[in-house]
């Protein structure tokens, strides 16, 4: 058992069936020795009496607020929180697995540049009393400072049968230093508490590998006099690192034709110009990529040729 | 470039930028493979880092490329003399297109094009011998590689940098 | 729109057994544990019984252990409870509940969905 915060405790629990689970000591927070009395959550019924109350967790019936009283008036309470360990690995009830990049990826993180500012993202079905708190640092062993925002319910999406949710907040390294080489990694930590459960994910990485460039912006066409070419042309977006002769992009264009099936030529320009043939009801499409490390590729921008 | 004489930029530009493409096909991201473990943090201390204070941002460039330099070159020899180790040279072999030996040479190129014949910088210590398991040293070159990635990227961009604004 | 719908109640002698079923619809109740909770005239609503997720885990109040049995159908969206050697005690309106995230609690309080509920009554 360990303390999460001020009379909140998380009970770890080997999970399965009649497992012994752990025994607890529960100690009333007062100098009153004589008359106390125990309960747990709103029900009336006295669990026991005396300054302590010895108690065998073993499943969530014997979580939640425990309360000690004497003459009708509450002295003190302990919230105890199961968290869950099977087979040896600590469960993963709350949030979906997102299986990208690979198995067990619970948490997603993003960046549009390199100022140590990135998004972290998860999903859940569950609707009700669900509450998240996030810590961040780089490095574990000597950790230095991340401060993130408060988690926000970013979306909401029908999935078959269910409604799932998606929770998202925003972290920003407090001493970022965009030119150099990181050496150590960010590590994000996310405890979730649903109702009496607690559950904690963790992820780590580098920013270089989480950079996801805004599409670009201001995409043009030219047509071109006397011909079936048109110049296109489009600029690095506002949210991307600079100056841009030092954090450089380098874009793949691409022009679609009506049809899916069509077969559509890519080509790869450090440039921010090029010359293609745009035929009627195709579309020009750019993306843009980190010009020396090979992080993701934004979303596409595109316009259409006519 | 020692001395304080400017380096070639435009030339380092190119061979930067392609020590990245040679460096991202010898090691593209195979599926996401998280190459971190548990005292990791400890482990990449034996390599140069280019690090906040080495002058490598836009603004230190300005100021006094030479640190900054200097810094790359020691990273180019650490990395040229790992790849020519027996981590990359032991069991098991190479694929005979594999592209480190390029990768290598352009190490070598780009060290010599920061530091010509006659003058020595100080160079880091070369690494602790290599691990004894094929599979160990297997997993060492992809973490090399992973690192040598980083590295040549900010390599790349100090090198962009100067050639579009400190150029002659 | 959630619904749970409870059936199976009805009026029977000590001794007897009855078989209440619950029907879910509306959302898949596969990631929810269900419960089984009654209320006799008078008095707090009470858990009766409960089974996790996966069915694999179950828990019953002292008064029932041994007697009652939950069991569920993840394909179908249906939990039963099926009540052996009932005893007028017994007796009481039976609800049918669910709570999101897997695991029982017994706990009125904490389940997210609920029926309508079905009168059980035990005569002497």
């Known amino acids: 058992i360990w303390e999460l915060k001020k009379d909140v405790y998380v009970v770890e629990l080997d999970w399965y069936p009649d497992a012994p689970g752990e025994m607890v000591v529960l100690t009333c927070d007062t100098p009153e020795e004589d008359g106390i009395t125990w309960t747990l959550d709103q029900s009336g019924e006295v669990l026991g009496s005396g300054k302590t109350l010895t108690i065998q967790v073993k499943e969530f019936g014997d979580a939640g607020q425990y309360t000690c009283h004497k003459g009708g008036e509450a002295l003190s309470h302990s919230l105890l929180l199961l968290h869950k360990k099977e087979d040896g690995i600590w469960s993963t009830d709350v949030l979906k697995d997102q299986k990208e990049p690979k198995n067990k990826t619970f948490l997603r993180c993003e960046a549009k540049n390199y100022s140590g500012r990135f998004t972290c993202w998860w999903l859940t079905t569950i609707s009700t009393d669900l509450t998240f708190s996030v810590k961040s640092s780089r490095g574990s062993s000597n950790p230095q400072g991340v401060t993130c925002g408060a988690v926000t319910l970013s979306a909401e999406r029908v999935r078959g049968d269910n409604k799932e949710y998606e929770y998202s907040v925003e972290c920003q390294e407090d001493s970022a230093c965009p030119a150099a080489e990181e050496r150590l990694p960010i590590e994000v930590m996310v405890d979730a508490i649903h109702k009496l459960k607690y559950e904690n994910y963790t992820s780590s990485f580098f920013i270089r590998d989480i950079i996801k460039p805004d599409p670009p912006k201001n995409l043009q066409l030219k047509p071109l006099k006397n011909s079936r070419q048109v110049e296109v042309s489009w600029e690095y977006p506002d949210t991307w690192s600079t100056p841009h002769s030092y954090f450089s992009l380098t874009f793949c264009i691409q022009v679609q034709g009506k049809s899916k099936r069509e077969k559509k030529d890519r080509i790869f320009t450090d440039k921010t110009s090029a010359t293609v043939i745009c035929r009627k009801n195709a579309s020009f499409s750019v993306q843009a990529q980190d010009r020396y490390y090979s992080s993701s590729w934004s979303e596409w921008a595109s316009v259409p040729c006519s | 470039v020692p001395g304080g004489s400017s380096p070639a930029w435009a030339q380092c530009q190119q061979l930067s930028q392609k020590l990245c493409t040679l460096a991202w096909s010898a090691h593209p991201l195979v599926g996401h493979m998280d190459l971190r473990e548990e005292g990791d943090e400890e482990t990449t201390n034996d390599v140069p880092h280019i690090q906040c204070g080495d002058g490598c941002d836009p603004q230190g460039l300005r100021d006094n490329s030479q640190f900054c330099l200097q810094r790359i070159r020691q990273g180019l020899i650490f990395y040229e003399k790992l790849l020519g180790s027996d981590i990359f040279t032991g069991e098991p072999s190479l694929l005979p297109d594999s592209p480190v030996g390029q990768l290598h040479a352009s190490l070598l190129g780009l060290s010599q094009l920061l530091q010509p014949e006659g003058h020595h910088w100080e160079t880091q210590q070369i690494p602790s011998p290599s691990p004894s398991q094929p599979w160990q040293r297997l997993l060492l070159r992809f973490k090399i590689l992973r690192s040598l990635q980083a590295f040549v990227a900010v390599a790349a961009r100090v090198f962009a940098h100067g050639a579009a604004t400190l150029s002659p | 729109e959630v619904q749970l719908v409870e059936s199976g109640g009805g009026l029977v002698q000590a001794g007897d057994s009855l078989r209440l079923s619950c029907a879910a619809s509306?959302?898949?109740?596969?990631?929810?544990?269900m419960g089984w909770f009654r209320q006799a005239p008078g008095k707090e609503r009470s858990f009766v019984a409960a089974i996790n997720w996966s069915g694999e885990l179950t828990g019953y109040a002292g008064s029932v252990k041994g007697r009652f049995t939950i069991s569920r159908d993840g394909v179908e969206n249906m939990v039963f409870l099926q009540m052996n050697s009932l005893v007028p005690e017994d007796t009481g309106v039976y609800y049918c509940?669910?709570?999101?995230?897997?695991?029982?609690?017994?706990?009125?309080?904490?389940?997210?969905?609920w029926g309508q509920g079905t009168q059980v009554t035990v005569s002497s």
């Open positions: 509306g959302r898949s109740f596969s990631n929810d544990a």
């Open positions: 509940a669910a709570v999101e995230g897997r695991d029982y609690y017994r706990g009125a309080q904490y389940y997210d969905y």
